[in-house]
C-alpha cells in the first residue's frame, strides 16, 4: 500500500510529488539496472538526505533532520528502483530533491519537487453574538492558503471576511458571515488547490414551529444528496441552543452505527437512520424547550447544518390553572 502522495510528471527529468503533512510519501527515481549501484539523495543540492553504496546505507553524514525518516526499497534496487521512502513529511521538507544514481554503466540524476499540503477538516459553526447571528467557516490548519467562497441561496456572495493566523507550518483561517434576520440557505466552500481537496459547509434555516406544552415535536434532518455519500464516515449531532451555547442532545456515528442519547425525551427512528434520515422527535415538551435546534451532519468533505426554531406555548389547561 503506497502512502498518500501523487506524482505529476513534468519535463526535464523533474517530477512533482505532492504529500500531506505528517504522512509518508515516496520520492520516485528509476535507473537502468546495473552493478556497483551508488545512490545519493540530496535536498536543495546541499543537504544529505540518504546515501547508499557498496551494498548498504551510509548515513554518517546524513543531515539530522532526515534521521530515521528515510529508506530505500532495498529489494528493488537491483531492478532499477532508487525511490526514497520518506516518513512524516513536514512543510519544511518542501523543495527540490536530487537523486544521483551511479552504476558500472552510467550516471543519472533525477530531480523531484516535493510540495506539502495541509488540510485539517474545516468546520462550520453557528454562533449568536448578542443579537447577531453568525455563520463561521473555519479551518484550524491549512496550507497553502485556501480559496474560500460563500453562497447565499446558491448565489455567490462577494463580501468575504477572512481572519487569518499564520504559523510556521500553516494558516489558521476563520471566515465569518453575519446572517442576522436571514431565512436564506448559505454555503461555504473551502478549497485546497494543491491537495485538490474541497470541503463544503451548508446551512439551512427551517420554518419556525409552534407547539403546545406536553406535545411532541418532530424535527427533520436529511442530508442533501449533492454532498452526502453514505459510504463515507460521518457524524450526526443534534444540539439545543440555550443562553447562547449549544448543549448536545444526541449523536450518531456512522462508522460504529452507535447512537448516544443525552436527553431522555429525545428519540431517533432506527429505520429512518438506515435510510439516511436523521429526523428526531422530542416528547413531552415544556416551556424551557423553546429555542433553536441544530442538526449537524459532518464528514471530512462537508458539514450540513439545519436549524429549527421551536416555540413552546402553554397549553389551555395550564393557562386556565394560572
Amino acid at each position: 500500500i503506497f502512502p498518500l502522495a501523487f506524482f505529476i510528471y513534468v519535463p526535464m527529468n523533474e517530477q512533482i510529488v505532492i504529500g500531506r503533512l505528517d504522512e509518508d510519501i515516496i520520492l520516485p527515481s528509476s535507473f537502468e539496472r546495473g552493478s556497483e549501484v551508488v545512490i545519493h539523495w540530496k535536498y536543495q543540492d546541499s543537504y544529505k538526505v540518504h546515501s547508499y553504496y557498496k551494498g548498504s546505507d551510509h548515513l554518517e553524514s546524513q543531515d539530522p533532520r532526515y534521521a530515521n525518516r528515510t529508506s530505500l526499497f532495498y529489494n528493488e534496487i537491483q531492478n532499477g528502483n532508487a525511490s526514497l521512502f520518506f516518513r512524516r513529511v513536514s512543510l519544511l521538507d518542501e523543495g527540490i530533491y536530487t537523486c544521483y544514481v551511479g552504476t558500472a554503466i552510467q550516471v543519472i540524476t533525477n530531480k523531484v519537487v516535493l510540495k506539502v499540503g495541509v488540510f485539517l477538516t474545516p468546520v462550520m459553526k453557528y454562533e449568536k453574538r448578542n443579537t447577531n447571528s453568525f455563520l463561521i467557516c473555519s479551518v484550524l490548519s491549512v496550507y497553502p492558503r485556501p480559496i474560500i467562497t460563500w453562497k447565499m441561496d446558491n448565489t455567490p456572495i462577494s463580501e468575504n471576511n477572512m481572519e487569518e493566523t499564520g504559523s510556521l507550518d500553516s494558516f489558521s483561517i476563520n471566515s465569518p458571515l453575519n446572517i442576522t434576520g436571514s431565512n436564506s440557505s448559505y454555503e461555504c466552500t473551502i478549497e485546497n488547490s494543491l491537495l485538490k481537496q474541497t470541503w463544503t459547509g451548508r446551512w439551512t434555516m427551517k420554518d419556525g414551529l409552534h407547539k403546545m406544552q406536553s406535545e411532541h415535536v418532530s424535527l427533520s434532518c436529511q442530508p442533501v444528496n449533492d454532498y452526502f455519500s453514505p459510504n463515507q464516515d460521518f457524524k450526526v449531532t443534534w444540539s439545543r441552543m440555550k443562553s447562547g451555547t449549544f448543549s448536545v442532545l444526541a449523536y450518531y456515528l456512522s462508522s460504529s452505527q452507535n447512537t448516544i442519547i443525552n436527553e431522555s425525551r429525545f428519540s431517533w427512528n432506527k429505520e429512518l437512520i438506515n435510510q439516511s434520515d436523521f429526523s428526531m422527535n422530542l416528547m413531552d415538551l415544556n416551556l424551557s424547550d423553546s429555542g433553536e435546534y441544530l442538526c449537524n451532519i459532518s464528514s471530512d468533505e462537508y458539514t450540513l447544518l439545519t436549524i429549527h426554531t421551536v416555540h413552546v406555548e402553554p397549553s389551555q389547561e395550564t393557562a386556565s390553572h394560572n
Epitope: E36, V38, K42, D45, S51, K54, G55, Y100, G102, V107
Partner: antibody
Amino acid sequence: QVQLVESGGGVVQPGRSLRLSCAASGFTFSDYGIHWVRQAPGKGLEWVAVIWYDASDKYYADSVRGRFTISRDNSKNTLSLQMNSLRVEDTAVYYCARDRSSGAMGYFVYWGQGTLVTVSS
Amino acid sequence: DIQMTQSPSTLSASVGDRVTITCRASQSISSWLAWYQQKPGKAPKLLIYKASSLESGVPSRFSGSGSGTEFTLTISSLQPDDLATYYCQQYQSYSYTFGQGTKLEIK
C-alpha cells in the same frame, strides 16, 4: 573519450608548497568523484585523496591529512591538489584517477598520465 | 588501515601458461577488491572490480575470484602483451590500500 591530464609537477624544497591540477574531458565531470593516487619512483601505488562529484565529501590518506587539500571546479572541469609542508617522502608521480561514479565506490576506472613531484633540498 | 599482501612479488612464466596471482587482506573486505595492470612507464589500467567483474574492454583471459580475505587474479593463457606489474586494491573502506605489486615477466 575520457581524458585526464595532470600538470603542476616539478622540483620543490622540503617544507614548501606545490599545487597540482588535473584537467578532465570526454565525460560529465560533475557526475564523477576524482582521486589522487601517487607512486614513488620504483615503488607501488598509494592512494592519496578523493573528492566526491559535488565536493560534499573529501577524504585523505593518513600520510597527507592536514597537509594536502583536494578541491574541484565543476564549471571548469578541473581538479586540484594543494600540497603544503612537503616532505622528501612525498616524491612521486601523482596521478588523477576517475572513480566509477560519485567517489563513493573507491576504485579507479580512468587514469591520467601522471605528473612528477620531486621534493629535494 | 587494511593491509594488502600480494604473492609472489615476481613471477616468470611462458606464453600460453596459466598464471595466478594471490592477494590477501588483513581483514575481511567482502568483495570490494580491484585488480590493475601497469606497464612500464604507463599509468595503471583497471582489469577487475568487485573481485570478479571484468572491466569493459579487458580481454576475457583475465579473471578474478575470491571474497573475504583471499583473492586471486588468473590469466588463463599468458600473452606477450601481459608483461606488466599487477596490483590489487581494497576499496572496502578509507584509506584505500594497494598490494605491493606482482611483477610478471615473460620467459
